[in-house]
């Protein structure tokens, strides 16, 4: 069984979070994917999503978030550029599969953004003076308002959880809704 885990990323303001969410490509290649934040005691909030159906290697930008879905490789790339302290929180990738529940992809990301100069960038970081060029072909996608009949009974865990699942994705069976947020300009 696969354990539902989370990874803690500690980055500085101005740096870029650049992560991959892998999925079973045979099942989910063209499914719409989303990047969500889960604040303690709140429902997951969708910050950005791919188009529906998801287009291969076609960047979608919502504000400082860029999503790129590589169908052939079963990978969703998520970039959050010019990070701010207020971006700190727990994030996850999900796959929309209406009318079924969304699927959550491992692993969750606990992002901690701190103020201050980063010094030498780490292997996955850009410098604090990062001027990240957005690909010129990016598009904006509207995310669906997803409503589930179930409710959240407690806040998500702050550390690694031993929730076992048989596959690399997990059904979000305890989520009331995924709140659609407006696409910012």
């Amino acid at each position: 069984a696969t354990k539902l885990t989370e990874e803690k990323y500690e980055l500085k303001e101005g740096q870029t979070l650049d992560v991959k969410c892998d999925y079973t490509l045979e099942k989910f290649a063209s499914s719409q994917k989303a990047w969500q934040i889960i604040r303690d005691g709140e429902m997951p909030k969708t910050l950005a999503c791919t188009e529906r159906p998801s287009k291969n290697s076609h960047p979608v930008q919502v504000g400082r978030i860029i999503l790129e879905d590589y169908h052939d490789h079963g990978l969703l790339r998520v970039r959050m550029v010019n990070l701010q302290v207020e971006d700190s929180g727990l994030y996850q990738c999900v796959i929309y599969q209406p009318p079924k529940e969304p699927h959550m992809l491992f692993d969750r990301i606990r992002l901690v953004v701190t103020k201050g100069f980063s010094g030498t960038p780490g292997s996955n970081e850009n410098s604090t003076q990062n001027v990240y060029k957005i690909p010129p072909t990016t598009t904006k996608a509207l995310c669906p308002l997803y409503t589930s009949p179930r409710t959240v009974t407690q806040a998500p865990p702050k550390s690694t959880a031993d929730v076992s699942t048989p596959d690399s994705e997990i059904n979000l069976t305890n989520v009331t809704d995924i709140i659609r947020v407006p696409v910012f300009n």
Partner: antibody, heavy 124, light 107 residues
Framework: QVQLVQSGAEVKKPGASVKVSCKAS????????INWVRQATGQGLEWMGW????????GYVKKFQGRVTMTRDTSISTAYMELSSLRSEDTAVYYC?????????????????WGRGTLVTVSS | DTQMTQSPSSLSASVGDRVTITCQAS??????LNWYQQKPGKAPKLLIY???NLETGVPSRFSGSGSGTDYTFTISSLQPEDIATYYC?????????FGGGTKVEIK
């Protein structure tokens, strides 16, 4: 010692399949993605795809889709790459390589550990 | 796919010389570039990651720089043991692609 040990050289006929193994030791096999890269004699390097040994998820370069299958056996810390419908142009050294990442989920594609390579010769 | 054009394809230099290899991507790869060294009959070895970071244990005479589409790999003072073929590899876009390689020889 941290290493990837690959299976021995193979000679195959066109149309046949080959399965190359890559045994990891000295580190936690399920913590790092395994990638496969090939190199035809005297030629450059060509990425074939990746596999997450923990979950078994895979991704293949388009030109190999339908012919390549990457699998693993976590009980013996071994990854496999099977290539079918072999043709002469598949004659190459096939390498397995570990993708190192500070964070498991990070978009980092650095191959810091390589097997010694397996020569696959396709000849009638 | 992102094409990586590496030049020169081969070069010959004297011990102690400064050697420079360039790699040009067909599109912006956001510093997502690595450099490898491959000696005959051996597997590649990671030298530089994310355009400019020196891999642990690699001599400081090796360095990398660049941004956008243009990247440079430098050996500040060529040593006999540096005879090898050097490859760049981008990961700014999938599929991952490698440059054609630069064979470095000693004069």
């Amino acid at each position: 010692q941290v290493q990837l040990v690959q299976s021995g050289a193979e000679v195959k006929k066109p149309g046949a399949s080959v399965k190359v193994s890559c045994k990891a030791s000295g580190y936690t096999f399920t913590s790092y993605d395994i990638n496969w890269v090939r190199q035809a004699t005297g030629q450059g390097l060509e990425w074939m795809g990746w596999m997450n040994p923990n979950r078994g998820n895979t991704g293949y370069v388009k030109k190999f889709q339908g012919r390549v299958t990457m699998t693993r056996d976590t009980s013996i810390s071994t990854a496999y790459m099977e290539l079918s419908s072999l043709r002469s142009e598949d004659t190459a050294v096939y390498y397995c390589a570990r993708r190192r990442a500070v964070y498991r989920s990070s978009w980092e594609w650095y191959f810091d550990l390589w097997g010694r390579g397996t020569l696959v010769t396709v000849s009638s | 796919d992102t094409q990586m054009t590496q030049s020169p394809s081969s070069l010959s230099a004297s011990v102690g010389d400064r050697v420079t290899i360039t790699c040009q991507a067909s599109q912006d790869i956001f510093n997502d570039l690595n450099w490898y060294q491959q000696k005959p009959g051996k597997a590649p070895k990671l030298l530089i990651y994310h355009a400019s970071n020196l891999e642990t244990g690699v001599p400081s005479r090796f360095s990398g720089s660049g941004s956008g589409t243009d990247y440079t790999f430098t050996i500040s003072s060529l040593q006999p043991e540096d005879i090898a073929t050097y490859y760049c590899q981008q990961y700014g876009n999938l599929p991952l692609t490698f440059g054609g390689g630069t064979k470095v020889e000693i004069k």
